[in-house]
């Protein structure tokens, strides 16, 4: 991603010759989209509208019950992250359909493209805590009987969204937006001005930190939960719980294209082919990670559904019912309250 | 052969206008931007914006933003550079400049002979 | 604006010698098609600037094989296999993959 990861349309003939050709004119401008652009383009217009709608949702059943219930609460802070995610869309979006070009001026390339990683980055921290929150249900129930509550919770989701702001700063401050004199055009990018080894440790702790660490971390807490409910048949409802690994897994799934192309672009030269062909990709990767900006909403009507047979109540009670259910957890001889779960968020083209 | 030729010399004095024309020949006048590039005595080359004549689009370097005004005309294969509100360093020899559009070579690769403009009081 | 710095800003050199000319940009000239457009221009004197070598290392239509360019990213070089007499002038390095277009301050080759 040195330089610009944003592509320009092809020009055919324009730059693949080394002899003059006097007659064939180029146009200043493209009205072509690549195919990639225009599936990126499908996908954020979906997304949009399924992640609004139904992170608003989300956001309208948990923030009542969010003073009493730590399920709530961790449903509650995915969505905002989700919300605030999808807002960037419509200009991301814009941006796409005039080739990349990008004329919301510096502030607006700095901030929203940063929406995304901020998105991710506080996803997996959220999802993290609330993979810590179900494995001491399970390990320590009786901590939890003692200690936890909604206040802590809070205090664990304001860390969360702390340390997501902090490892944003980077491309939040490396984005500028770069006037090309031919074709005309203003991109919005990042510019590590020309420090590889700058580049590609950003790229790297991105790759560490929010993608390989928590895979490693989730697996392994989740392989020791599933291991010990199963074995242990000892708990009541493992709604909460497959709802958690549903949404953990559509994160790894959905953020894996952009994490991999992004780590393989800041070690190839930006004229090289190969790092070319996956700036063509770019936009598509980023829509691809952004997809978990609404699958969230709809893993819980899933489960919802699922859980009920079928569909008899009205989608909020639906939501209301898998967000902030209370399940039991046995674990000897006591009996602690618990709530679970997560969503999953992206990133976009830094 | 591609061809730019200017209009001769100017004395302006400081605050009025001038106006340079380029006429270019010898190649697909609409498909080329013109830029202008100026040079003081003894300093390096500046580039002030560009015009693409086919639709009159225009480009301006920031620093003259709002002094200078570049047109074309096709009937004529001609375009024309007006600089206001002149003031002595302003004084440079002018350049018109072909930036190729239909080619490979994606470079500014044929300039005019060059205007001086003085500007004295 | 991307500023290119040009060095050395005077170039004595024996005629039949070689010559080497610098040019670094205060930022990537990459552009997002992959291209570079790093252009160097002559401008002998009383003339008008001539291209010489456009995108780091094409000679232009009617450019001599002695003159060669090379580079990558920020760094730029211009060379002269074997000066001769005619290759007198200020050579100027000039970026167009961004706006506004800027030049080197420009090298002033002249013979010992």
């Known amino acids: 991603m040195n330089s610009f990861n944003y592509t320009t349309p092809d020009y055919g003939h324009y730059d693949d010759k080394d002899t003059l050709d006097l007659n064939t004119p180029v146009d200043k401008t493209s009205n072509t989209l690549r195919v990639p652009d225009i599936l990126a383009l499908v996908i954020f217009a979906v997304v949009f509208l399924v992640g609004v709608l139904g992170n608003a949702l989300v956001v309208w059943v948990t923030a009542f019950e969010a003073k009493r219930t730590i399920n709530a609460i961790w449903f509650l802070n995915l969505a905002v992250a989700d919300f605030l995610s999808c807002l960037a869309l419509p200009i991301l979006f814009t941006s796409i359909v005039q080739h990349h070009h990008w004329p919301f001026g510096g502030a607006a390339c700095s901030i929203l493209p940063s929406l995304i990683l901020l998105n991710m980055y506080a996803s997996i921290l959220l999802l993290a805590t609330i993979s810590a929150d179900r494995f001491l249900l399970v390990f320590k129930p009786i901590w939890c009987q003692n200690f936890r509550g909604a206040g802590l919770a809070w205090i664990a989701c304001a860390v969360a969204w702390g340390l997501a702001l902090l490892l944003t700063i980077p491309s939040f401050l490396y984005r500028v937006v770069r006037e090309e004199y031919f074709p005309p055009k203003v991109l919005c990018g990042v510019d590590y001005s020309h420090d590889k080894r700058r580049e590609r440790a950003v790229a790297i702790v991105r790759l560490v930190l929010g993608f390989l660490w928590p895979l490693l971390t989730l697996t392994i807490c989740y392989t020791f939960i599933l291991l010990r409910t199963w074995s242990r048949r000892a708990t009541r409802s493992t709604k909460t719980l497959k709802v958690v690994v549903a949404v953990v897994a559509s994160f790894f799934i959905f953020w894996l294209p952009y994490q991999v192309t992004g780590i393989m672009m800041s070690f190839l030269e930006p004229s090289s082919p190969t790092f070319l062909l996956l700036n063509k990709l770019d936009s598509l990767c980023v829509s691809f990670a952004y997809i978990n900006c609404c699958i969230n909403p709809i893993i819980y009507v899933v489960a919802g559904q699922g859980f009920q047979g079928r569909l008899r109540k009205s989608l909020p009670s639906l939501l209301r019912n898998v967000l902030t259910e209370e399940s039991v957890v046995r674990e000897s001889k006591s009996f602690t309250r618990s709530t679970v779960d997560t969503m999953a968020q992206k990133t976009q083209a830094v | 052969q591609v061809q730019l030729v200017q209009s001769g010399a100017e004395v302006k004095k400081p605050g009025a206008s001038v106006k340079v024309s380029c006429k270019a020949s010898g190649y697909a006048f609409s498909n080329s931007w013109m830029n202008w590039v100026r040079q003081a005595p003894g300093q390096g080359l500046e580039w002030m914006g560009r015009i693409y004549p086919g639709d009159g689009d225009t480009k301006y370097n920031g620093k003259f933003k709002g002094r200078v005004t570049m047109t074309a005309d096709t009937s004529t294969s001609t375009v024309y550079m007006e600089l206001s509100s002149l003031r002595s360093e302003d004084t440079a020899v002018y350049y018109c400049?072909?930036?190729?559009?239909?080619?490979?070579?994606?470079?500014?690769?044929?300039w005019g002979q060059g205007t001086l403009v003085t500007v004295s009081s | 604006d991307v500023v290119m710095t040009q060095s050395p800003l005077s170039l004595p050199v024996t005629l039949g010698e070689p010559a080497s000319i610098s040019c670094r940009s205060s930022q990537s000239l990459v552009h997002s098609n992959g291209n570079t457009y790093l252009h160097w221009y002559l401008q002998k004197p009383g003339q008008s600037p001539q291209l010489l070598i456009y995108k780091v290392s094409n000679r232009f239509s009617g450019v001599p094989d002695r003159f060669s360019g090379s580079g990558s990213g920020t760094d730029f070089t211009l060379k002269i296999s074997r000066v001769e007499a005619e290759d007198v002038g200020v050579y100027f390095c000039?970026?167009?993959?961004?706006?506004?277009?800027?030049f080197g301050q420009g090298t002033k080759l002249e013979i010992k």
């Open positions: 400049a072909r930036f190729l559009l239909i080619s490979t070579v994606t470079a500014v690769d044929y």
């Open positions: 000039s970026q167009s993959t961004l706006v506004p277009l800027t």
